[in-house]
């Protein structure tokens, strides 16, 4: 007997062909001999089966001797043997309907687990293989699990169900809820305005939740909450903000924070958390602020940086268009009795300048 695989919610067309290429009488029945559908002249007739309002045929094919049974909005329980009776002969087709669903939601937080569950008819023994958007293959039986979802797991998962040497393909769209970047560093000169941006790696119709930015200043012994906010349908409203610093926040996505000026006492690391409505767990993004100050005090020219810098960063002091006078993997450098001219303080990583501050040294008379 012919085997046809179907997908839950889809439409399947079971074929039945007569030797005579003309419209003749036919009937489709299920394994319990209950009439599903047939014809009378140019019209469809329907029996008392549970498929009544989901069964159809194609009248346009009848005069070619084809009498298909179309079943719409397939259910697992539609799995059965269907019998087509035409010209005193019987054609049997076994229909097996499968469903593949994400156990929880298809919108999952980064780091959470994804479980895919296969619904299958009794007596079937299918195998499943899924391919993630980044090309990772996972295999299983009734359930497949992927732990620690990453941002690259966002997208269409393609799963193939194999049964009786036949296969049916499912596509499931998974959205991993995360910030575009896990971490970012902002380099600023003292006194400059600081812009922090927290773009999301996903788009959804309605986004509701609440968030907070905790800040650990390098000079402080403990961290403190700089700002708390609510998100309602992609609109941002500030709930509470510290007096120092007085942060400002954009009203629309992406989440955007402005620090009026970069000061050494603000240099450090922050953690922005976002709790989304109806989701357990939070989204996190780390943000770092490095502040540079160049000063001249009497005969001493000093350049300092505060904040989380890597040990491989180089801090240099140089006179414009000249070789560096001093260059060290430290957070402060100085030059005694600097000659007059425009001095540059540079923070660089493998020759690439991350931050630059200029200071004019006047001639001493």
């Amino acid at each position: 007997k012919k085997v046809v695989l179907g997908k839950k919610g889809d439409t399947v067309e079971l074929t039945c062909t007569a030797s005579q290429k003309k419209s003749i009488q036919f009937h489709w029945k299920n394994s319990n001999q209950i009439k599903i559908l047939g014809n009378q002249g140019s019209f469809l007739t329907k029996g008392p089966s549970k498929l009544n309002d989901r069964a159809d045929s194609r009248r346009s094919l009848w005069d070619q001797g084809n009498f298909p049974l179309i079943i719409k909005n397939l259910k697992i329980e539609d799995s059965d043997t269907y019998i087509c009776e035409v010209e005193d002969q019987k054609e049997e087709v076994q229909l097996l309907v499968f469903g593949l669903t994400a156990n929880s939601d298809t919108h999952l937080l980064q780091g959470q687990s994804l479980t895919l569950t296969l619904e299958s008819p009794p007596g079937s023994s299918p195998s499943v293989q899924c391919r993630s958007p980044r090309g990772k293959n996972i295999q299983g039986g009734k359930t497949l699990s992927v732990s620690q979802l990453e941002l690259q797991d966002s997208g269409t998962w393609t799963c193939t169900v194999l049964q009786n040497q036949k296969k049916v393909e499912f596509k499931i769209d998974i959205v991993v809820l995360a910030f575009q970047k896990a971490s970012s560093i902002v380099y600023k000169k003292e006194g400059e305005q600081v812009e922090f941006s927290f773009p999301l790696a996903f788009t959804v119709e309605k986004l509701t939740g609440s968030g907070e930015l905790w800040w650990q200043a390098e000079r402080a012994s403990s961290s403190k909450s700089w700002i708390t906010f609510d998100l309602k349908n992609k609109e941002v409203s500030v709930k509470r903000v510290t007096q120092d610093p007085k942060l400002q926040m954009g009203k629309k996505l992406p989440l955007h924070l402005t620090l009026p000026q970069a000061l050494p006492q603000y240099a450090g690391s922050g953690n922005l958390t976002l709790a989304l409505e109806a989701k357990t767990g939070k989204l996190h993004q780390e943000v770092n602020l490095v502040v540079m100050r160049a000063t001249q005090l009497q005969k001493n020219l000093t350049c300092e940086v505060w904040g989380p810098t890597s040990p491989k960063l180089m801090l240099s002091l140089k006179l414009e268009n000249k070789e560096a006078k001093v260059s060290k993997r430290e957070k402060a450098v100085w030059v005694l009795n600097p000659e007059a001219g425009m001095w540059q303080c540079l923070l660089s990583d493998s020759g690439q300048v991350l931050l630059e501050s200029n200071i004019k040294v006047l001639p001493t008379w």
């Epitope: 559908l37 140019s42 469809l44 007739t45 009544n52 989901r54 346009s60």
Partner: antibody, heavy 121, light 108 residues
Framework: QVQLVQSGAEVKKPGASVKVSCKAS????????INWVRQATGQGLEWMGW????????GSTQKFQGRVTMTRNTSISTAYMELSSLRSEDTAVYYC??????????????WGKGTTVTVSS | EIVMTQSPATLSLSPGERATLSCRAS???????LSWYQQKPGQAPRLLIY???TRATGIPARFSGSGSGTDFTLTISSLQPEDFAVYYC?????????FGGGTKVEIK
């Protein structure tokens, strides 16, 4: 042009029979069904059944089974609907209509003007 | 059998207005199997729409049909004096074919 011409009005007594004719012209009679639809005064449309002029196959709703006979004469491109055991509630205008099967679509595109049948003692 | 229910029974509108007629099937049917007919007093019905949304030959563009499942709609975008009539929906999803009770569109 394509048209269906029906026979004239009839007055019948309860228990009698009536036979309404429907003559087709302007198209190949055997290529399309003829449907019969009736309408009591001030009421809606009620489908009675059909005849396939090519095969002679017919079908009718359960309500009329055993009382209605649908036939055709291909040589004169005419379809007939005979309703027996008439009762007062059969008083209505009886229409014949051409049934078209176009792809998966079926519709009645050409109608006769109707035949008034009055059942009264 | 499938019962077709039309609403409202009567629609009182002025020429130029938009008419929206509803037809509900007692069970889900394919849009392939839904037709609309217009009938004027003393006349035979006239085919307007078949397959839920396809206009029959010679039917003006102001008539449009839509819907799926159990709910279908006939819309007349701007009523003309000749459009005041009774409108019937009809299904041929399966036997017996059934008509709705009709909606009378009358001049306000």
């Amino acid at each position: 042009q394509v048209q269906l011409v029906q026979s004239g009005a009839e007055v019948k007594k309860p228990g009698a029979s009536v036979k309404v004719s429907c003559k087709a012209s302007g198209y190949t009679f055997t290529s399309y069904d003829i449907n019969w639809v009736r309408q009591a005064t001030g009421q809606g449309l009620e489908w009675m059944g059909w005849v396939n002029p090519n095969s002679g196959n017919t079908g009718s709703t359960q309500k009329f089974q055993g009382r209605v006979t649908m036939t055709r004469n291909t040589s004169i491109s005419t379809a007939y609907m005979e309703l027996s055991s008439l009762r007062s509630e059969d008083t209505a205008v009886y229409y014949c209509a051409r049934g078209v099967l176009k792809g998966d679509y079926y519709y009645m595109d050409v109608w006769g003007k109707g035949t008034t049948v009055t059942v009264s003692s | 059998e499938i019962v077709m229910t039309q609403s409202p029974a009567t629609l009182s509108l002025s020429p130029g207005e938009r008419a929206t007629l509803s037809c509900r099937a007692s069970q889900s049917i394919s849009s392939t199997y839904l037709s609309w007919y217009q009938q004027k007093p003393g006349q035979a019905p006239r085919l307007l729409i078949y397959g839920s949304s396809t206009r029959a030959t010679g039917i003006p563009a102001r008539f449009s049909g839509s819907g799926s499942g159990t709910d279908f709609t006939l819309t007349i975008s701007s009523l003309q004096p000749e459009d005041f009539a009774v409108y019937y929906c009809q299904q041929d999803d399966h036997l017996p074919l059934t008509f709705g009770g009709g909606t009378k569109v009358e001049i306000k």
